[in-house]
Interface confidence: low
């Protein structure tokens, strides 16, 4: 498997790394055990089944999910298509007349920019 680079690297991918300090001996996931917190769904569990890949992901190296197109996350649990805001991609800024908006996980959040010309 070669390196892949994505706009938003996440635990589910072999994330592109911009330095060579760390040897590439372990998949780019961070399973974390918590003795006091029982599993509460795939996104909230601090200890996930390492063979569990959702949305058609393929388990590789025993603990790493190779996700199909548009899915990401350490278990392929996130769907980029559901997180876009219409035609605005996830994690993208959209300038409007008197505000600056950002698409974040399917919600367009706008921040007033009163300092712009013609904006009170």
């Amino acid at each position: 498997l070669g390196h892949q680079e994505f706009a938003r690297p996440s635990r589910g991918y072999l994330a592109f790394r911009d330095d060579s300090i760390w040897p590439q001996e372990e998949p780019a996931i961070r399973p974390r055990s918590s003795q006091r917190v029982p599993p509460m769904g795939i996104q909230h569990s601090k200890e996930l089944n390492r063979t569990c890949c959702l949305n058609g992901g393929t388990c590789m190296l025993g603990s790493f999910c190779a996700c199909p197109p548009s899915f990401y996350g350490r278990n392929c649990e996130h769907d980029v298509r559901k997180e876009n805001c219409g035609s605005v991609p996830h994690d993208t800024w959209l300038p409007k007349k008197c505000s600056l908006c950002k698409c974040w996980h399917g919600q367009l959040r706008c921040f007033p920019q009163a300092f712009l010309p013609g904006c009170d």
């Epitope: 690297p9 399973p31 996104q43």
Partner: antibody, heavy 119, light 112 residues
Amino acid sequence: QVQLVESGAEVKKPGASVKVSCKASGYTFTSYWIHWVRQAPGQGLEWIGENDPSNGRTNYNEKFKNRVTLTVDTSISTAYMHLSSLRSDDTAVYYCARGPNYFYSMDYWGQGTMVTVSS
Amino acid sequence: DFVMTQSPLSLPVTPGEPASISCRSSQSIVHSNGNTYLEWYLQKPGQSPQLLIYKVSNRFSGVPDRFSGSGSGTDFTLKISRVEAEDVGVYYCFQGSHVPLTFGQGTKLEIK
């Protein structure tokens, strides 16, 4: 080169809140976790929590869970630690540290921010 | 919580002599994925901590080979084969397998 630069020292009164920032440079911010660790004067290190800038996921030390909020602004590669309801025993140096995806280690640390809580 | 107990708390060493620090966890810190996320950090006087060893025995980039880590399960050791003056500071073990992540209380190494 990798750098984590924290905001300046703060002096707060008991009951107040503080927000410490940690500006990252020299690497892809969303590819590494950010940890927060504190050290009271003359004491050891205490882990507060960690934040994954790529998706906002957090793990907290239960001791701080009701008072601390970890956030990031990926547009400026900056992480924040907000601690509320400050007490005198919150007086400490607060460090941010980078956590690689591949291991749990904290490989680069900020210089620390001294937060003093005093009436 | 996973309590990490270090010994000794103070370690006076003659330059050139070996040094050894023990770290014991209250429960096994082997993660369910089979890895043991036991790390060692050194905090030199007036500085931020720095990573020495990760995953029990792996030296971090730039760490001299006189530092070595070993152990398994609940018992871990950091060894310095020949102590140098620049090694003074407080050494912390740390477990990253289970939330909350926890540090040992620290071992202060000083030169005799």
